[in-house]
């Protein structure tokens, strides 16, 4: 029997019946096998046909075999009912391999002439299957020519038998509190041959809780226990299952902070699986009762591990942990069901006992020693030597700690002496005048250093005085021996102040004329005001209407007097204000060079003589009353005058304090 | 004035409970903590932990949890400490004290003796 | 747990003399809101203890002057100007800043 070509040989040709295209002989058998190569199929048609027609052709065939499979067996020329000749179709092997036989018996009534056929070897595509059969790949098919291959789609792995996917479903691992886990691709039909491992991982002291929900379909057996697919629980105390079977499994409490779930398939079924919705408990902290004026927040119905709540406490109370304050308050609960942290306590605000105010008191409003949370405090100044600047005085404890005022400052009201109070009301003389009483000058200054000097007292711890008077210890400000309330030039009885610093006007230019002769002392405590020490009025801006020509200004010192000595006694004359341009002519002629008195200065004294002040008196205070606000303020400086004092036609001069009320409030406000 | 008076001296077997009072007077007891501090014979002293009455929250040292447990009876004014399981080593002197914003410790109560012994 | 250590542990002091006892914690007792929370108590023999000072220095009402604390940090120190009969005992510091709350080893101030 003839063999066609065998493979890798180009597999096409032609077959034909013996001696065609004439008749063929009786008795003849001829048999042709074709083999294609792997993954192809044989393709084979007729172009002739022509055999002798039996019942069932059983006379003389054509019989086409693929295998053990016969795929037709052909005689006539046309098909009838019960026999089949090939016409127009084509015939296809079922493998690689199709084996064709041609026969004829011993007789034919007339003559056949055969048959003459075609055939080709072609790609076969596996990827394509008849309705109802199994698909050659589970997910994706790719066909070749001479073959196929299979993939999967994402999360599966090609199985080794090359056709399934097999899910990539192990190694997730749960960390949350509660959540959900399921067969792949449920509800639809779980994969084929997998194997899934799911682990619930929780923090020690939570305990993993296990519900079946929606439905549950897994592969099962009726006399056999889950032997294809099954789904098993484990956690380190026991194990749960295997399940499979159509039966929802009942709630797994499983005592364990870790679970893991497997779940095995093989290859065959078509089940759609399950679905699990785990939550977890653990020992519950007992239920935190708020302290009284405070709230819990969040409210729960319980509280397990890692639960946490706060405490808030209502405006005026604050929290504190027994002694400790605290900025916040968080309390988690633990493995063993105790809070982390001890409850607080709401506790009322108490701003504490409130400072004491200098040359003030307090007074406590609401009751004796009541600090607490809306508490009213009223502080006031000594009366008569201080007032009270800004502030009412009134305070109250608020919400924050800290005593604050009706305007919502937290710092100390002040108490400012009252400034220009004198026991005096007429006048007298120094140079020419008349011993002062106790409390006629309060503001009077002794200034020891190197020479006997004066000033006046600002505020409670400045002194104003002539910058040269105490230019020699601008740099030595402690070497200044300052001496206030008292009378006696000479009395130990005294209230001694000491320098911090000397502030000399920058204007201020020594041994050459007296322009600008104006200084600040700061003392570096501030001095206790009384009826002998008691600070004068600057200028107020409409005080110039009190110093014009002819007003009367008082000087006070324990300068030279007419015998030529300093006085024992402090002294103080009345003297009047002389017009300027007077002033200026007066000190034009020699030995006083031109331009000696200047617009910063002021002259006082009388034509005639007599009253002046005198060297010892410098740095002291003219001062002059202010009858709106009946307080004395200073209006000048004792600064220079004529040799002689006293002299008639010469006048006392005075640095002009107005012309520098910014440059002391500057340095007041700086230092 | 505050005053905390503790009840009378306790002998006790090994393993038994004891419980221990501290009767407060003199203020307002929900609103101060009453500390516990155990002071074994001739030793030093050892904080216990702390009740606050007002919200009944307890708060205890790590080293005494499980041994001591406190509890006030609001309507007496009384602190309690529950001593179990008791040993030789909780033989001691057990003294309450009350606290206010300066600290926990600025009045005591005149201590209870307890002694375990069989 | 913050340890106290207290020196010396027995001080003998002649009476009208001075008297220094130091504490030494093993972190620093200063709290978020500035304050430090140590205290000095004395117990004298058979008594319950008596707090002395607050907050490093401040004495509690009744406390003679003679008393003084200091220090800050980690590092305290409790001063008797002049030793009286009735000082006699055991002293303890304790911090109060931390939980749990420590007390000091005591050091025990006799008469010479």
């Known amino acids: 029997t003839p063999l066609g070509p065998k493979w890798p040989e180009p597999v096409f040709g032609r077959l034909a019946s013996p001696g065609f295209p004439g008749e063929y002989a009786n008795d003849q058998e001829r048999r042709w096998t074709l083999t294609a190569p792997p993954g192809y199929r044989l393709r084979l048609y007729f172009t002739h046909f022509d055999l002798e027609l039996s019942h069932l052709c059983e006379y003389d065939f054509v019989k086409l075999s693929s295998g053990a499979k016969v795929l037709a067996t052909l005689c006539g020329q046309e098909s009838t009912d019960t026999e089949r000749a090939p016409g127009k179709d084509t015939f296809y092997s079922l493998g690689s391999s199709l084996d064709i036989t041609f026969r004829s018996d011993y007789s034919n009534e007339k003559p056949f002439t055969g048959f003459e056929a075609f055939y080709a070897a072609e790609d076969i595509d596996e990827c394509q299957v008849a309705p109802g059969e199994a698909p050659t790949c589970d997910h994706h098919c790719h066909n070749h020519l001479g073959g196929f291959y299979c993939s999967c789609r994402a999360g599966y792995v090609l199985h080794r038998n090359k056709r399934t996917c097999s899910a990539l479903c192990s190694g997730q691992v749960f960390t949350q509190r509660s959540g959900e886990l399921s067969s792949p691709e449920y509800p639809r039909p779980y994969p084929k041959l997998s194997s899934c491992t799911y682990s619930i991982s929780l923090e020690e002291g939570f305990s993993v809780i296990l519900d079946f929900v929606e439905s549950f379909d897994v592969e099962t057996h009726p006399e056999t226990l889950c032997p294809y697919d099954f789904l098993k629980i484990q956690t380190d105390r026991e194990e749960h299952g295997p399940f499979c079977g159509k039966t929802l499994p009942h709630r797994i409490e499983t005592k364990s902070n870790t679970v893991t779930i497997t779940f095995v398939t093989d290859e065959s079924g078509d089940h759609t699986g399950w679905k699990i919705h785990y939550t977890s408990t653990a020992q519950p902290c007992p239920y935190p009762m708020a302290p009284p004026n405070g709230h819990v927040s969040p409210v729960q119905a319980k509280y397990i591990l890692k639960d946490s709540f706060s405490i808030f406490c209502e405006t005026g109370y604050e929290l504190l942990q027994g002694h400790l304050p605290l900025k916040s308050f968080t309390a988690v609960c633990q493995k063993d069901g105790s809070w982390d942290r001890p409850m607080p306590a709401c506790s009322i605000v108490d701003c504490g006992p409130p400072d004491d105010l200098p040359s003030g008191r307090v007074e406590y409003i609401t009751g004796p020693g009541v600090t607490t949370y809306k508490a009213v405090i009223q502080y006031s100044c000594e009366e008569t030597f201080y007032t009270m600047k800004v502030n009412d005085g009134k305070y109250v404890c608020e919400a924050d700690g800290f005593w604050t005022s009706s305007k919502g400052e937290k710092s100390l009201p002040v108490c400012e002496p009252v400034c220009g109070l004198s026991a005096r009301t007429t006048g007298g003389r120094i140079y020419g005048g008349q011993k002062a009483k106790p409390g006629d000058f309060p503001w009077q200054v002794l200034i020891l250093g190197g020479t006997t000097a004066a000033g006046a007292l600002l505020y409670d711890n400045w002194v104003l005085t002539a910058a040269h008077a105490v230019y020699e210890q601008k740099h030595d400000a402690s070497a200044l021996d300052i001496r206030m309330g008292t009378l006696k030039r000479l009395s130990p009885h005294y209230t001694q102040a000491w320098s911090e610093a000397v502030f000399i006007h920058e204007g201020y230019t020594h041994d050459a004329g007296f322009d600008n002769d104006i200084a600040l002392i700061k003392l570096n405590n501030k001095v206790v005001i009384n009826s002998n020490i008691t600070p004068i009025c600057l200028p107020r801006k409409e005080a110039e209407s009190f110093m014009r020509t002819d007003d009367i200004g008082t000087a006070s010192g324990w300068g030279l007097t007419q015998r030529g000595f300093l006085a024992r006694n402090l002294m103080y004359v009345d003297i009047p204000i002389v017009d300027h341009q007077k002033c200026t002519a007066a000190y034009e002629k020699p030995p006083y060079p031109r331009g000696s008195v200047t617009a910063n200065m002021l002259c006082a004294g009388l034509e005639s003589g007599g009253k002046d002040s005198c060297r010892g008196d410098s740095g002291g205070a003219l001062v002059f009353l202010d009858s709106e606000t009946e307080r004395w303020f200073v209006g000048g400086i004792v600064s220079w005058g004529s040799m002689n004092c006293g002299e008639a036609g010469q006048y006392g001069v005075y640095t002009k304090v107005i012309n520098y009320i910014p440059w002391i409030e500057n340095i007041i406000s700086d230092f | 004035q505050v005053q905390l008076q503790q009840s009378g001296p306790e002998l006790v077997k090994p393993g038994a409970s004891v419980k221990i009072s501290c009767k407060a007077s003199?203020?307002?007891?929900?609103?101060?903590?009453i500390n516990w501090v155990k002071q074994r014979p001739g030793q030093g002293l050892e904080w216990v932990g702390w009740?606050?009455?007002?919200?009944?929250?307890?708060y205890y040292n790590e080293k005494f949890k499980g041994k001591a447990t406190l509890t006030v009876d609001t309507s007496s004014s009384t602190a309690y400490m529950l001593l179990s399981s008791l040993t030789s080593e909780d033989s001691a002197v057990y003294f309450c004290?009350?606290?206010?914003?300066?600290?926990?410790?600025?009045?005591w109560g005149q201590g209870t003796l307890v002694t375990v012994s069989a | 747990d913050v340890v106290m250590t207290q020196t010396p542990l027995t001080l003998s002091v002649t009476i009208g003399q001075p008297a220094s006892i130091s504490c030494k914690s093993s972190?620093?007792?200063?709290?978020?809101?500035?304050?430090?929370?140590l205290n000095w108590l004395l117990q004298r023999p058979g008594q319950s203890p008596k707090r002395l000072i607050y907050?490093?220095?401040k004495l509690d009402s009744g406390v003679p002057d003679r008393f003084t604390g200091s220090g800050s940090g980690a590092d305290f120190t409790l001063k008797i100007s002049r030793v009286e009969a009735e000082d006699l005992g055991v002293y303890y510091c304790?911090?109060?800043?931390?939980?749990?709350?420590?007390f000091g080893t005591g050091t025990k101030l006799e008469i010479k």
């Open positions: 004290a009350r606290g206010d914003r300066s600290g926990p410790f600025p009045y």
């Open positions: 003199g203020y307002t007891f929900t609103d101060y903590y």
């Open positions: 009740i606050f009455p007002g919200s009944d929250s307890a």
């Open positions: 972190q620093s007792l200063l709290y978020s809101n500035g304050k430090t929370y």
């Open positions: 907050l490093v220095s």
């Open positions: 304790v911090q109060v800043t931390h939980f749990p709350f420590t």
